[in-house]
Structures are given as C-alpha cells and as structure tokens.
Interface confidence: medium
C-alpha cells in the first residue's frame, strides 16, 4: 500500500467520541460491472455542445483525480459545423461525495465531503429576458 | 437514538483485520459554498436532448433515493421543436460514491460503493456505419 507520513494528531480509531464517525470498508464494490462499459468517452467531441476535460488532482482526497468538463463554446454546433449563438452550451453539474483525509496525512481517518463537478455539457434554448 | 434490529454478525470496530477499514467522519463538509450553485434544475426541459428523472430507491444505501436521468427521445429537438432523428440524445454518465450498510442493519458499519448514474443527456452526431 501507500506510505503516508502520519500526522501525530491523527484521531484514535477507538475514541468513541470521535464525531459522527463510522467504520467504512474501502474495498470499493463496483456495481457497474453488468452495465455496458461503453463509456461516454467520445461524446465530448461528438456533442453539439462539446467539452474539454480538465484534470483536477488532490492527493488528500479520494478519488484523488477528478476530470472536470468545460464547455468549448458559449453557443452550440449547428448542422453546418458552425457555432450557433442562438443556443447555449451549458455544463451539467453534479455533486459527488469524496473522502478527504482529515486531519491531513492521516492514512485511516477521513471526512466525507461534497464537491460540485461538471460532468459534461448540453445544448439549451436560452432564457431571453425582455426589457419592458 | 434509532432502534435498528442489530445484525449479530456486525463487525467489531476494534477488529484490526476488518478489511481496509477506515474511520470516516460523516459530518459532510460542503465545498460548494463559494460558488453560487445555480442548480441546473431546468436544463432537463430546456435541452435539445431533454430528459426525465426516474426514482431509484434502495433503503440500505445512502443516499437511499437517487433520481436518474433518462433521455426523452432517441433523437434531438430541432429549431422547430420537432424530434430530429439524424441526431441522437445520449445519457452523460458519471460514477458516484455511495455508502452501503454492510452487513445490512449494522448502524455503524458501511462499505463504499461506486455506482454509475446518468446525470443528464447531450445531443451527439450519430456514428454511421457504412455497409460495404
């Protein structure tokens, strides 16, 4: 396994007062094995609201690498392959749960954290505000 | 506290052999406060690849209820508001971490699980296979 310099202030696993703490088995079970692993990997190029993927890395977090989508254009790609600014490319965002080492560098102590990630983009009709 | 019929096979928190077990503080920290999480709540109706949300419930999982996106059409909505079958609505999928009570009914013992959820839909150009 990985060797993490242990923080001397790491909480004691046996401490019954360690706040809201539960035992979690990190042998992660993946329920997705029966799904067709046809990842939506090429959708980012084929979409009418294409996106680029940016790597976000944090060694104190699990998962340590998260790929974030950034829409390539403000508008959407039309049938001619041009950007149509009458439509909008918008990120589809999702909150995900991650584990953060807390205190930092403690190998067996984590806190659940909610972070907002952009998963991909979709093309939407804009909301037009009419000025009276 | 809560009355849960306790499973006699619940693991002992002090058991050093309990596989890959860590202490997790479940006071979920929200990293999203500095952003204005403009919830993408209306995109599912405004998208050219609109989607419906379907309820998936599992009482032994947290969160117990997950609403999954299902694309409304095979094709995409064109400028006239009709479905264009020359384009495809496809789901954007993302793996998320959930907690599962394991063994079931043990109040303080969980397993991390990865599940694949459909977050929304995007409109893509189809892959056309030409028959020789």
């Amino acid at each position: 396994g990985i060797t993490i310099p242990r923080n001397p202030g790491c909480p004691n696993s046996e401490d019954k007062n360690f706040p809201r703490t539960v035992m979690v088995n990190l042998n992660i079970h993946n329920r997705n094995t029966n799904t067709n692993p046809k990842r939506s990997s090429d959708y980012y190029n084929r979409s009418t609201s294409p996106w680029n993927l940016h790597r976000n890395e944090d060694p104190e977090r699990y998962p340590s690498v998260i790929w974030e989508a950034k829409c390539r254009h403000l508008g959407c790609i039309n049938a001619d392959g041009n950007v149509d600014y009458h439509m909008n490319s918008v990120p589809i965002q999702q909150e995900i749960l991650v584990l953060r080492r807390e205190p930092p560098h403690c190998p067996n102590s984590f806190r659940l954290e909610k972070i907002l990630v952009s998963v991909g983009c979709t093309c939407v009709t804009p909301i037009v505000h009419h000025v009276a | 506290g809560i009355t849960i019929p306790r499973n006699p096979g619940c693991p002992n928190s002090e058991d050093k052999n309990f596989p890959r077990t860590v202490m997790v503080n479940l006071n979920i920290h929200n990293r999203n406060t500095n952003t204005n999480p403009k919830r993408s709540s209306d995109y599912y109706n405004r998208s050219t690849s609109p989607w419906n949300l379907h309820r998936n419930e599992d009482p032994e999982r947290y969160p117990s209820v997950i609403w999954e996106a299902k694309c409304r059409h095979l094709g995409c909505i064109n400028a006239d508001g009709n479905v264009d079958y020359h384009m495809n609505s496809v789901p954007i999928q993302q793996e998320i971490l959930v907690l599962r009570r394991e063994p079931p009914h043990c109040p303080n013992s969980f397993r991390l699980e990865k599940i694949l959820v459909s977050v929304g839909c995007t409109c893509v150009t189809p892959i056309v296979h030409h028959v020789a």
């Epitope: 909610k114 | 929200n30 406060t33 969160p63």
Partner: antibody, heavy 126, light 107 residues
Framework: EVQLVQSGAEVKKPGESLKISCKAS????????ISWVRQAPGQGLEWMGG????????DYAQKFQGRVTITADESTTTAYMELSGLTSDDTAVYYC???????????????????WGQGTTVTVSS | EIVLTQSPDFQSVTPKEKVTITCRAS??????LHWYQQKPDQSPKLLIK???HSISGVPSRFSGSGSGTDFTLTINGLEAEDAGTYYC?????????FGPGTKVDIK
C-alpha cells in the same frame, strides 16, 4: 406520496414529560431525516432537533440540549420526540417534518422540509 | 448560530400586485436557504428550496433568488389564496434557524 401523521393533543403539568409520535408512510423512512419544529402561540417556527435513521444520528438545538430526545423505530417507521421538565413556555404546536435526503438531478437534495405532519397541540398548565 | 432577518414584517397587498420579501443571513450561507408558506391553522408548506429552486405543485408565480447573505422571495401577481405568513429557513449550519416571518394579507 409521503405522509406524516402525528399523535393527538396533550395537556401537561409543569415538570412533567411529553412524548409525541410521528408515523411516516411512503418513501424510504430509513433514508430520510425527521426534524421536529415547534411554534408557540402567535410566534414563529423554531427547530428543535432531528434524526437521520440511516446513520442513527441525532442533532439538537442548544436551547433544548439535555431536555429533548429524538428517536426513531425503523420497524414501525415512527419517529418520537420526548421533552422533559415542561414549563408553560413549552406550550406550542409541535410539528414533525421530513428532510428528503435524496440525490436529485445531480444534487444531494437535503436539509429542507418537504412534508410536514399535521401538528400536535401541547398545553402546559398547572 | 446564524440569524435570519426578514423584511417587511407585514404587508397588505391588493390581488394581482407583486410581492417581494427579503431575508438576510448574518453570514454567508451559499444557497442553503428555503422558503415556506404557512396559512392560519395549517402546517408550513415548502415553496422554494436552495434559494431559487421551484417545487413541484407550487404555482409558478412564486420564485426565489439570491445567494450568500441576501435572498428574495417574489410572488408575481398575488392571489387571495396566498394570504399567510412566509418564513425563510437556513440549513447551512446547525442549529437550523428560521426567519421571524412576514405576514401577507389581502386588501
């Protein structure tokens, strides 16, 4: 459709204890949270505390700490709120309310009350 | 604890008029603010969650906006059935707190 049905009105004497029930039907009781909110006559809403059955967590407002106990029984899908050392200031309508704890449209849809019980009127008088 | 202040305390409004209720938090609460309506002798009812997200079954004339410390509930075209007290509610940190309420009545 989620429904929360509370126990009936109570009349208590100062110093006594009170235990109100909130029976839930519909939805995953284990997965959602139940909070208790009270409203004194002519006053606003006051959060007392809540429970998340999935984790067995309870949270209490400091004001009620030591005097309130919130419990839940998964087998009967019922939450309870017990308040001890009653005084006339505890005369109020007590509501249970559901915190959905759902993952909806990409977000953890939690920490608000989408369904409420009908309220239990409690009068504390000597 | 986070203190929520609402203004106005009371508003008397003619039907079809626009009503604006503001809620200010004593610290940044992101968008963890919700709005409830309570009619006399009834339980509160959720109107808006997360500052601006509409609730299924709630008329579209109700809308919410804001983030951080300043929030607004707007009723576009008040109807007679909208009479009642409106509360804002923060769930950013424990203890959860409610605003003191804004009573709306129909002229």
């Amino acid at each position: 459709e989620v429904q929360l049905v509370q126990s009936g009105a109570e009349v208590k004497k100062p110093g006594e204890s009170l235990k109100i029930s909130c029976k839930a039907s519909g939805g995953s009781f284990k997965g959602y949270g139940i909070s208790w909110v009270r409203q004194a006559p002519g006053q606003g809403l006051e959060w007392m505390g809540g429970i998340t059955p999935f984790f067995g967590w309870t949270d209490y407002a400091q004001k009620f700490q030591g005097r309130v106990t919130i419990t839940a029984d998964e087998s009967t899908t019922t939450a309870y709120m017990e308040l001890s050392g009653l005084t006339s200031d505890d005369t109020a309508v007590y509501y249970c309310a559901r915190d959905p704890n759902e993952f909806w449209n990409g977000y953890y849809d939690t920490h608000h009350f989408d369904y409420w019980g009908q309220g239990t009127t409690v009068t504390v008088s000597s | 604890e986070i203190v929520l202040t609402q203004s106005p305390d009371f508003q008397s409004v003619t039907p079809k008029e626009k009503v604006t209720i503001t809620c200010r938090a004593s610290q940044n609460i992101g968008s963890e603010l919700h709005w409830y309506q309570q009619k006399p002798d009834q339980s509160p009812k959720l109107l808006i969650k997360y500052a601006s997200h509409s609730i299924s079954g709630v008329p579209s004339r109700f809308s919410g906006s804001g983030s951080g410390t300043d929030f607004t509930l707007t009723i576009n075209g008040l109807e007679a059935e909208d009479a009642g007290t409106y509360y804002c509610h923060q769930t950013f940190s424990l203890p959860y707190t409610f605003g003191p309420g804004t009573k709306v009545d129909i002229k």
